[in-house]
């Protein structure tokens, strides 16, 4: 998954079309419905942090 302009997301993150930015794949075990989770690795890290501010 890549950001517009061919700027790739860093390792462990994936592009969210719903937010127009890279998002941390670590949140996907908690909320797999997020659009960016489709672009995350099949086996995300066991420890993840929430994305709340």
């Amino acid at each position: 998954e890549q950001a517009p302009g061919n700027a790739p997301c860093s390792s462990g993150s994936s592009w969210s079309a719903d937010l127009d930015k890279c998002m941390d794949c670590a949140s996907c075990p908690a909320r797999p419905h997020s659009d960016f989770c489709l672009g995350c690795a099949a086996a995300p890290p066991a420890h993840f942090r929430m994305l709340w501010p």
Partner: antibody, heavy 120, light 108 residues
Framework: EVQLLESGGGLVQPGGSLRLSCAAS????????MMWVRQAPGKGLEWVSY????????HYADSVKGRFTISRDNSKNTLYLQMNSLRAEDTAVYYC?????????????WGQGTLVTVSS | DIQMTQSPSSLSASVGDRVTITCRAS??????LNWYQQKPGKAPKLLIY???SLQSGVPSRFSGSGSGTDFTLTISSLQPEDFATYYC??????????FGQGTKVEIK
């Protein structure tokens, strides 16, 4: 101060159309996802539609899919909802709301609402 | 869609009372649960996000707890301005965001 001001509501016949606007001020509009939420008279809240900061991604509740279109003009700090093929059950107060900057998390600021009445 | 069920649908309480409102999800939603307050003729106001985080500017008498399927909004000491309708909202099953049916807090 963050402000969201809806306009465009009114009385329309079944099958008719309306375009709602939501003018944003007091914050930088372009980085935020935006939503429309509605509330039928005396009823609870129903999420209607979502649009990404760039406007490239949109989502709709099943009840309005194919009839409503959400859009935004970041140069004008304005959110829109084009409502076509209106039905009596679309009668409600329509609120625009600012989404959180993570992912569909919450609605931290709301407009005062605009009433849409669909009746013959 | 995930269904959100609030209880009670209404309650009567006095100023100074401790008030508890519950919200149950039809399936686990982790901590993706928010609470709003709505007064008649006004827009909803965000009180609590992520189940237990207090929104900026909201009085500390409001608190939230829970995870999974069961959540609680507590008002530790009800004030006159707290008489309103309260809604829970899940943001787990995106984009199918859903709200509870509301709990109306009335003056006893």
């Amino acid at each position: 101060e963050v402000q969201l001001l809806e306009s465009g509501g009114g009385l329309v016949q079944p099958g008719g159309s309306l375009r709602l606007s939501c003018a944003a001020s007091g914050f930088t509009f372009s980085p935020y996802p935006m939503m429309w939420v509605r509330q039928a008279p005396g009823k609870g809240l129903e999420w209607v539609s979502y649009i990404s900061p760039s406007g490239g991604s949109t989502h709709y509740a099943d009840s309005v899919k194919g009839r409503f279109t959400i859009s935004r003009d970041n140069s004008k700090n304005t959110l829109y909802l084009q409502m076509n093929s209106l039905r009596a059950e679309d009668t409600a107060v329509y609120y625009c709301a600012r989404g959180g900057d993570t992912y569909f998390d919450y609605f931290d600021y709301w407009g005062q609402g605009t009433l849409v009445t669909v009746s013959s | 869609d995930i269904q959100m069920t609030q209880s009670p649908s209404s309650l009567s309480a006095s100023v100074g009372d401790r008030v508890t409102i519950t919200c149950r999800a039809s399936q686990s939603i982790s901590s993706y649960l928010n609470w709003y307050q709505q007064k008649p003729g006004k827009a909803p106001k965000l009180l609590i996000y992520a189940a237990s985080s207090l929104q900026s500017g909201v009085p500390s008498r409001f608190s939230g707890s829970g995870s999974g399927t069961d959540f609680t909004l507590t008002i530790s000491s009800l004030q006159p301005e707290d008489f309103a309708t309260y809604y829970c909202q899940q943001s787990y099953s995106t984009p199918g965001i859903t709200f509870g049916q509301g709990t109306k807090v009335e003056i006893k």
